[in-house]
Structures are given as structure tokens and as C-alpha cells.
């Protein structure tokens, strides 16, 4: 698995170089998280024939994936700073649970799944820092998170490879569009 | 041709023990989970458990009916396929199925059965 | 649990008409546009024998006298024109997820 971010080489040998700041850390942070999906990607899309599934095929399904939506106030028209610094905290924390079911679903990315997984918590400590309103954030309920990972893992073989391609494909989507909007902030 | 061959079933005193062996040909068997089904006349077609792949760390899943007495256990470097049952009851009496469910998950591979009989 | 509810139990037919045989789940077993559910026929002293997967797909050697719909949580096997070979027990099962669940069965007669 690649260093996390603060832990390469090139940091303890500049210990001149200015310190990051909060945004530059999370930006940092977010494209190593993205470089991480990018190779569990290749894996699955390596595995199967799941990442020439269709749009409209994955639209027909029963997860519950966060999503950008016009209303979090995170698209360039109507951008909202503290409203879409909510959104992006949230739906980072109803990823975690899609996160922990993805632990298990890789052979030779197995240290890949967990440094996302393990990444993913630092970035939301990161902004959970920068945001002021943090009671509008919701936390899931932990009963609810416990019985969707049941289900998740119950599920047959096929499906579980093609939900590994939705959470995937929807996190980075996620993250990417996150990482636009907190460029602007 | 994919076969599934069955064996080490009879009789059985209730509380006793019991391990069954299904052999696998024909097929690359380490890329395919593999389960038991049991039938009996009361219960009809049952689901007993199932083993996953290496990849999956051999998860193991059961039915409610047998969780805590049977064990599902695998050795891929000879093809088979294991269910050793313990502390066994008279509702543990059917044919016991080996199967292999396809990547979809449809269970199109059938062995012939191997009987069970739980009696005193 | 997903409950798989067969009916009917039984069914007599005249050789040459229609046999139709229904399974309703207790959830839906669809995802990403398939719906997981398979059909098996089974005679005395034999195991089960898939017919249709994914509830319209015909399986491996299965005669075209056999088809099967349905979506969601109602599902069908059709059996037309029946012949003298179709005296069986018909069975559905959800493959969507664990635990894997079977109807009651449908015990098929020539009337």
C-alpha cells in the first residue's frame, strides 16, 4: 500500500519546507484516498466484466449510495460553504459502513482496501475540524449500518462484485466532486 | 463433465456425529462457493450452509437450524467439499445435497444425495 | 429471511395444456436490473434439476415447452404444451442472498 500522506520520504527529508495547511493536507488527502480506489478498481474491472456494466443497469439497485445533489450547495452554482461542508462530512460517514464491507472483497489489494478504509476516517477527523456547524451533521445509526453490512455480505456472488463496482465507482465520484468543491472554500 | 459426488451418509443415534464428503470434477473448483441442501418430506427443500472462497477467507454461512452443531469446511487441493455435523437431532434426517451454485448465484450443479438417518 | 410461497401445491393438467405454477417472495430478489430467482424440477429418487434461472432463463438442455416470468415478488413457470415427461415436483428458489430459500413445492399430475 503507498504511504499515507505527511509519510513520504521527501517530507522527512525537507524539514524546512512550510507545513501544509488544512486545506492543502485535505486535498492531499483526498487524492491519495482517489489513487487508492484507482487501484481496487483495476482489480475488480480485472476480475470481472462488472466495469462494462451499463449506467441504467447500475441505477437498478438497492443501495443507498451518497450522492451530490443541487440542493448540498456544493456545485458551482449556489455553492453554500457551510452547507456542502455538512454534506461532504456526512456522506463520507455513510461511506464508512460500504467501506467496512469492501474490507473482505480483495485478494491481492487487501492492504489498498484497508489504507482507504483507514484514510477515509482521518479525512472526516480533518474536516470535521474545518466545519462550524457540526450539529447538523448526522451520524448513521450504528444498529442500521450493522444490518445493511449483513446484508451486503449475504448477498450472492455476482451481486457482491457488482455492488464492490457501485461503492467504487460512487466514492470516487463523490470524492472528486468533494475535492472541487473544497478547493473553492 | 461437472459432477458432485456425495458420501458418508446413514444412520445416526440422536446426539451423535456424523461428517460427509462431497467430491468435485470437472470444474475449477476453487473459483466456486459450495453449499449443502437437505430434503426431507416435513421441511421440503432446506439450505444447511455454505463456504466461500479463499478470497473471502473461506466465510463460512448456516442455517439457524444447525448453526453451533455443523461445520462446512473445504480442501481445495483435492476438490471436496465437507459438512461435519454434530450433536445430531431426529429433524436432522433428509438427503443431504452437495451443491455449487453458479456466478449468479443459481444452484445448477446437483450431486445425487447422500441419506441421513437420525434415530434411536 | 426471504419466505418463498408456492402455489398451488398441487395440479392436475390435461397432456397438451397449459401448467402454470406461482412463486411470491416475501421482498423483492431483483437487483441491478435481474431478478434472482430459479426454478428446479425434481423427480422421485432424483436431485433437483435447474429449468429456469434468473426467472426467465432457459437452463442447459431445458426444452422450450418450459418458460418463466415474473419480477419483484411474483414469479411463474409455465409449462405448454404439457407432456407425460413434465410428472414431477416443480420447486422455486431465491438465489439473491443467503439464507438461499426454496417454495413448498408444486406436485404436477396429468389429469
Known amino acids: 500500500a503507498p504511504v499515507p500522506p505527511g509519510e513520504d520520504s521527501k517530507d522527512v527529508a525537507a524539514p524546512h519546507r512550510q507545513p501544509l495547511t488544512s486545506s492543502e493536507r485535505i486535498d492531499k488527502q483526498i487524492r491519495y484516498i482517489l489513487d487508492g480506489i484507482s487501484a481496487l478498481r483495476k482489480e475488480t474491472c480485472n476480475k470481472s466484466n462488472m466495469c462494462e456494466s451499463s449506467k441504467e443497469a447500475l441505477a437498478e439497485n438497492n443501495l443507498n449510495l451518497p450522492k451530490m445533489a443541487e440542493k448540498d450547495g456544493c456545485f458551482q452554482s449556489g455553492f453554500n460553504e457551510e452547507t456542502c461542508l455538512v454534506k461532504i462530512i456526512t456522506g463520507l460517514l455513510e461511506f464508512e459502513v460500504y467501506l467496512e464491507y469492501l474490507q473482505n472483497r480483495f485478494e491481492s489489494s487487501e492492504e489498498q482496501a484497508r489504507a482507504v478504509q483507514m484514510s477515509t476516517k482521518v479525512l472526516i477527523q480533518f474536516l470535521q475540524k474545518k466545519a462550524k456547524n457540526l450539529d447538523a451533521i448526522t451520524t448513521p445509526d450504528p444498529t442500521t449500518n450493522a444490518s445493511l453490512l449483513t446484508k451486503l455480505q449475504a448477498q450472492n456472488q455476482w451481486l457482491q462484485d457488482m455492488t464492490t463496482h457501485l461503492i467504487l465507482r460512487s466514492f470516487k465520484e463523490f470524492l472528486q466532486s468533494s475535492l472541487r468543491a473544497l478547493r473553492q472554500m | 463433465e461437472v459432477k458432485l459426488e456425495e458420501s458418508g451418509g446413514g444412520l445416526v443415534q440422536p446426539g451423535g456425529s456424523m461428517k460427509l464428503s462431497c467430491a468435485a470434477s470437472g470444474f475449477t473448483f476453487s473459483n466456486y462457493w459450495m453449499n449443502w441442501v437437505r430434503q426431507s418430506p416435513e421441511k421440503g427443500l432446506e439450505w444447511v450452509a455454505e463456504?466461500?472462497?479463499?478470497?473471502?477467507?473461506?466465510?463460512?454461512h448456516y442455517a439457524e437450524s444447525v448453526r453451533g452443531r455443523f461445520t462446512i469446511s473445504r480442501d481445495d487441493s483435492i476438490n471436496y467439499v465437507y459438512l461435519q455435523m454434530n450433536n445430531l437431532r431426529a429433524e436432522d434426517t433428509g438427503i443431504y445435497y452437495c451443491?455449487?451454485?453458479?456466478?449468479?448465484?443459481?444452484?445448477?450443479?446437483w450431486g445425487a444425495g447422500t441419506t441421513v438417518t437420525v434415530s434411536s | 429471511d426471504i419466505v418463498l410461497t408456492q402455489s398451488p401445491a398441487s395440479l392436475a393438467v390435461s397432456l397438451g395444456q397449459r401448467a402454470t405454477i406461482s412463486c411470491r417472495a416475501s421482498e423483492r430478489v431483483d437487483s441491478f436490473g435481474i431478478s434472482f430467482m430459479d426454478w428446479f424440477q425434481q423427480k422421485p429418487g432424483q436431485p433437483p434439476k435447474l429449468l429456469i434461472y434468473a426467472a426467465s432463463n432457459l437452463g442447459s438442455g431445458v426444452p422450450a415447452r418450459f418458460s418463466g416470468s415474473g419480477s419483484g415478488t411474483d414469479f411463474s413457470l409455465n409449462i405448454h404444451p404439457l407432456e407425460e415427461d413434465d410428472v414431477a415436483m416443480y420447486f422455486c428458489?431465491?438465489?439473491?442472498?443467503?439464507?438461499?430459500?426454496f417454495g413448498g413445492g408444486t406436485k404436477l399430475e396429468i389429469k
Open positions: 428458489q431465491q438465489s439473491k442472498e443467503f439464507p438461499w430459500t
Open positions: 451443491t455449487r451454485p453458479r456466478y449468479e448465484g443459481t444452484f445448477d450443479v
Open positions: 463456504i466461500r472462497l479463499r478470497s473471502n477467507k473461506y466465510a463460512t
